[in-house]
Interface confidence: low
């Protein structure tokens, strides 16, 4: 696991405990909450980050509105179950024995049930739509400059392969970033779009997960792009299963 050797920290995840106890005295970092070893050369999975967040002092969180056409993470924080690879387990339960099925980004995709609820597989979220509203500026941003800057951000900061940024749409003041990644497209070592979206969401909220890299300073041709609202929509490879009651 790559970590900064000089002071033994994890550049990509500050919610870790690191010590030089790896092979040959190498720096090894473990996620808070789960104690799982993490690869500090890439993003940590959202599941392990949520688990770490739940082990730390609780922060308030704004809930977002659900969408008609996609899943929105409007259930708030929970302490997730992660598998040995750090992915969400398909079935999640809380401390009062309420269970639900989640997708690969940990967002609920079924009605809540009890412990007899069965979740046969972890359904992949293959399309993420990040909907941003920026603060007023002197004029609209140039669309191609904005597009290039956001693609650069996802490539350099979040290590997401450019082919997974499907599109950047802009109608002032709304920016939409479309991330697409099918199971068949994701190769070993590729950052997951769900993890990239989560790091981006935390950056936008001023809660950067990166160690000592400062917050997100997003500029388009020198002009600061300040986001005042974020909504993230998640579309799964298999449609979610909610009762009609929830849809009305």
């Amino acid at each position: 696991h790559t970590a900064a050797q000089d002071n033994c920290t994890c550049p990509t995840n500050k919610m870790t405990v690191c010590s030089p106890d790896g092979p040959g005295g190498r720096c090894q970092c473990r996620a808070l909450g789960s104690g799982m070893a993490v690869d500090c050369s890439t993003l940590t999975s959202k599941c392990l980050l949520l688990k770490a967040r739940m082990s730390a002092p609780k922060n308030a969180r704004t809930l977002v509105r659900p969408s008609e056409h996609a899943l929105v993470d409007n259930d708030g924080l929970y302490d997730p179950d992660c598998d040995p690879e750090g992915r969400f387990k398909a079935r999640q339960c809380n401390q009062t024995s309420v269970c639900w099925c989640v997708n690969s980004v940990g967002v609920r995709r079924t009605d809540k049930g009890d412990l007899s609820l069965r979740c046969d597989e972890l359904v992949r979220t293959h399309h993420i739509l990040i909907d941003l509203r920026h603060r007023p500026t002197a004029g609209a941003f140039n669309h191609s400059d904005l597009d290039a800057e956001l693609r650069r951000l996802f490539r350099e900061r979040y290590r997401l392969h450019p082919k997974f940024v499907a599109a950047v749409h802009y109608e002032q003041p709304t920016i939409q970033i479309e991330l697409r990644q099918n199971t068949s497209q994701k190769a070993a070592g590729d950052v997951d779009i769900g993890d990239a979206a989560y790091y981006f969401e935390r950056d936008i909220k001023g809660e950067s997960l990166f160690q000592g890299r400062g917050g997100l300073d997003l500029r388009v041709r020198g002009e600061p792009l300040q986001v005042e609202r974020t909504l993230i929509y998640y579309l799964d490879e298999i449609p979610p299963k909610f009762s009609m009651k929830r849809l009305t």
């Epitope: 999640q92 339960c93 401390q95 009062t96 024995s97 412990l115 609820l117």
Partner: antibody
Framework: QVQLVQSGAEVKKPGASVKVSCKAS????????MQWVRQAPGQGLEWMGW????????KYAEDFKGRVTISADTSTSTAYLQLSSLKSEDTAVYYC??????????????WGQGTLVTVSS | DIQMTQSPSSLSASVGDRVTITCKAS??????VAWYQQKPGKAPKLLIY???HRYTGVPSRFSGSGSGTDFTLTISSLQPEDFAVYYC?????????FGQGTKLEIK
Amino acid sequence: QVQLVQSGAEVKKPGASVKVSCKASGYTFTTAGMQWVRQAPGQGLEWMGWINTHSGVPKYAEDFKGRVTISADTSTSTAYLQLSSLKSEDTAVYYCARSGFGSHYWYFDVWGQGTLVTVSS
Amino acid sequence: DIQMTQSPSSLSASVGDRVTITCKASQDVSTAVAWYQQKPGKAPKLLIYSASHRYTGVPSRFSGSGSGTDFTLTISSLQPEDFAVYYCQQHYITPLTFGQGTKLEIK
């Protein structure tokens, strides 16, 4: 230390009811589920049901529905199993066992010592 | 209901032997399998939960593995106190179900 202490052995006639108690100590009663498992002489383990001590809601195995009642008294940290319309094949050792609930799932980390219920005419 | 089928049903071995007991679920139970040890006249004791997690205080000679439908309990070097009946249990979905047991006897 964490302990589950069950009531003593019972001898019952067919058609009667039996109520077995399980007193918990050493942990906060409402932070774990209480499961009930039975074992007929020389046989394996059979799950009967459980109670969510946090909400007070029980859940029963299909084979026992209508004959079994699981309850809990949080003031005394005691769980109860009542089985009615007893038959000779209900002769078994009845165990209470603590389980996690929620994301801890249902494995049984602490067991009572067992209560032998004998059904005989 | 999910059936848990253990094999073998009985096993004779000697102190120091490496022993493997298998458990097959009739459908996918992820890694939600526990293993218990039971001695005559006593309550079962938890050894392994979630397929591979050793319970507190359980000796390291006991290990568990598997996921999906196939699970294994291994005792790396049998000790005299290990002769007992072993049960697997799926803790994935209700009704919770156990294997029929494997009786481990001294050869």
